[in-house]
């Protein structure tokens, strides 16, 4: 494959990444799959600057990001280290609330209406953001 040098149509470029902002709502797993099919991943927030950029585009609507703890510890979908990385949780979050009886806690993270993060049950029909890096190899064949 070739290196992607510009963003696909309807994606927004920012700091060498491309972002796609959904309008519809999906469960976290469906949103995750959607991004993967686009050769991308759910957004991984690595800085306050990126947080502000995403927040500006999504507005006051709950929106999934690429952070979950479905297998135990919190993990970013692209492997970015959670412990040392940027975080913007709401106060008292994540509470990984186990009361819902789904066999685990609230396992998926989303931007709330004020942009700060909350963990929630993963079946909620929230919007989502896909991200892909411009410098990574594309799955598409090079243009001749």
């Amino acid at each position: 494959g070739s290196e992607r040098t510009c963003c696909p149509v309807n994606w927004v470029e920012h700091e060498r990444s491309c972002y796609w902002f959904s309008r519809s709502g999906k469960a976290w797993a469906d949103a995750d799959n959607y991004c993967r099919l686009e050769d991308a991943h759910l957004v991984v927030v690595t800085s306050w600057e990126e947080q502000k950029f995403v927040q500006h585009h999504i507005g006051p609507v709950n929106t999934w990001m690429g952070l979950h703890d479905q297998n135990g510890p919190w993990k970013w979908v692209d492997g970015t280290d959670y412990e040392t990385g940027f975080k913007n949780w709401r106060p008292e979050q994540p509470d990984d609330w186990y009361g819902h009886g789904l066999g685990g806690g609230e396992d998926c993270a989303h931007f709330t209406d004020d942009g700060r993060w909350n963990d929630d049950v993963c079946q909620r029909p929230y919007r989502w953001v896909c991200e892909t890096e411009l410098d990574k190899a594309s799955q598409e064949p090079p243009l001749l």
């Epitope: 609507v61 819902h100 009886g101 789904l102 066999g103």
Partner: antibody, heavy 120, light 107 residues
């Protein structure tokens, strides 16, 4: 105060169409998702459809999918339900209801309902 | 789709009684459950949301509890105005299914 008023109900023959409206007042309509819920005579409540605050998303019960269309006009603070290919089992009181937020947080305020009767 | 069941389907009670209605989801729905009251010929009225949060203006004799699959609505001391049908509704994801209702009438 917050108010929802439905209109447009009536008697209609099977296979025909009808359009219900819901006028809102007392709150900022464009900030809230809106729902339709129906209740057949002597029966329980059935959720019909939702439209998000900005009209970007709509979702339907399987029983009405492909026949009913929910829409909104935020400039006029009105919600609509276009009902096509009506069947006898669509006979019900139809309520519009406000979502607690943009469209995924449940229902808080309800209208008084409008009656639809599908009969030949 | 997730199914909602309520029990009992009807109950007879007296003024002053403590009344408990249960709602069960066929799969976990988190805290995303609401309770509504409906009187004959009237629109439903919201009582409880997020399983246990009291709707503004609703008296504190109404309370909700539970999470996941099992939920309860309790009326601590039944008053004449409380004789009605009560519905639960899930709103974790679409469709927002209602339970079949519980009718509370005079003993």
């Amino acid at each position: 105060q917050v108010q929802l008023v439905e209109s447009g109900g009536g008697v209609v023959q099977p296979g025909r169409s009808l359009r219900l409206s819901c006028a809102s007042s007392g709150f900022t309509f464009r900030n809230y998702g809106m729902h339709w819920v129906r209740q057949a005579p002597g029966k329980g409540l059935k959720w019909v459809a939702v439209i998000w605050f900005d009209g970007s998303n709509d979702y339907y019960a399987d029983s009405v999918k492909g026949r009913f269309t929910i829409s909104r006009d935020n400039s006029k603070n009105t919600l609509s339900l276009q009902m096509n290919s009506l069947r006898a089992e669509d006979t019900a009181v139809y309520y519009c209801a406000r979502d607690r937020s943009v469209g995924y947080d449940g229902l808080d305020v309800w209208g008084q309902g409008t009656t639809v009767t599908v009969s030949s | 789709d997730i199914q909602m069941t309520q029990s009992p389907s009807s109950l007879s009670a007296s003024v002053g009684d403590r009344v408990t209605i249960t709602c069960r989801a066929s799969q976990g729905i988190g805290k995303y459950l609401a309770w509504f009251q409906q009187k004959p010929g009237k629109a439903p009225k919201s009582l409880i949301y997020a399983a246990s949060s009291l709707q503004s203006g609703v008296p504190s004799k109404f309370s909700g509890s539970g999470s996941g699959t099992d939920f309860t609505l309790t009326i601590s001391s039944l008053q004449p105005d409380d004789f009605a049908t009560y519905y639960c509704q899930r709103y974790d994801t679409y469709p927002f299914t209602f339970g079949p209702g519980t009718k509370v009438d005079f003993k």
